[in-house]
Amino acid sequence: ELCDDDPPEIPHATFKAMAYKEGTMLNCECKRGFRRIKSGSLYMLCTGNSSHSSWDNQCQCTSSATRNTTKQVTPQPEEQKERKTTEMQSPMQPVDQASLPGHCREPPPWENEATERIYHFVVGQMVYYQCVQGYRALHRGPAESVCKMTHGKTRWTQPQLICTGEMETSQFPGEEKPQASPEGRPESETSCLVTTTDFQIQTEMAATMETSIFTTEYQ
């Protein structure tokens, strides 16, 4: 079931999914001057079975200036029984990112992809927050949000994270200064409290907040 709205916005913080639940859609978006090929996929879809999940469909962009005069061979969604048995892995991914059953890794970029990624999350998806550069966590509560279904409606839980400017307050006792590249990652979706010092976006893609859609922008 798709989540109707988007994860909550926290001032001076960004969010990121470590892995994507089956059913998650990633829109095929092309950068300015390019468009989806006419018979190509509309979106990528995290799909699979209990033992393996991967992204079906490949996004393809072609120049808007040149009209397709030759028929292009379009990678299409795979038939269930023919699904790949090797996960689509990008060199920028941590090894354990998609170790959760029923989840997909961050898909690798495609040629002429738009600068922002638009995901549509499903119920049960968890996203993690961290303060943007120049801000740090003032509050050591859970820095994650989960899309839940309640009374037939979807809602995101509120992350307990407050981000403050470096100069605004002295460091909390026991709170480390943000490191350049912490390696920590939550071990389970249900038991780990994540703060900015525990968490790093492990890819070149940093999450950006935009009204009404979750996007990921290349830096």
């Epitope: 798709l2 709205d5 859609m25 978006e29 509309l42 799909t47 638009i118």
Partner: antibody
Framework: QVQLVQSGAEVKKPGESLKISCKGS????????IGWVRQMPGKGLEWMGI????????RYSPSFQGQVTISADKSISTAYLQWSSLKASDTAMYYC???????????WGRGTMVTVSS | QSALTQPASVSASPGQSITISCTGT?????????VSWYQQLSGKPPKLILY???KRPSGISDRFSGSKSGNTASLTISGLQADDEADYYC??????????FGGGTQLTVL
Amino acid sequence: QVQLVQSGAEVKKPGESLKISCKGSGYSSTSYWIGWVRQMPGKGLEWMGIIYPGDSDTRYSPSFQGQVTISADKSISTAYLQWSSLKASDTAMYYCARLGSYYAFDIWGRGTMVTVSS
Amino acid sequence: QSALTQPASVSASPGQSITISCTGTSSDVGAYIYVSWYQQLSGKPPKLILYDVSKRPSGISDRFSGSKSGNTASLTISGLQADDEADYYCSSYTRSSTWVFGGGTQLTVL
């Protein structure tokens, strides 16, 4: 509440033009594809085409290509279906529907009844 | 593109089970898992009842189930109830990035 609100019923004469609308609300409406489906009186569903309001990319069924135009205005979260010259055979109920996960249409509008008669 | 083939009508008594078939080609039903089923009650818009061949959206009874073999998908309704009386349509995504619906099946609960 996630919904698609369609414009009201229309009665037109052959040769007239028409543009009906479908407004999405309760979700990120510019980032979901919207499809149009025709249902002639007493008949089944026919897929006409689909549009992505974010950039107005459009796909048409071969049966409807050149017969109708699908467009969108993302600033007001609205998709449109239009005819430049209606025919009696265009008399039908027209539904808009949101494309959800697994390439299925998960949210439907209530339909716009278009009657073309001289 | 031709409509997917469904039986025009099916009837059964309350409590019984019925199966509606939906036959396509290797370019649609046979190509992907993207087969969905819709229920249309009289005078109402269609409602998604199954997607990805056999998955149910929230709020849809587990009496509705689906399967696929080759170019044919099937919808089974068990423990038939009076309010299941409706038209049922299958749909499939196609190799040309379009969709095709079945002709529809009218279910009568006797």
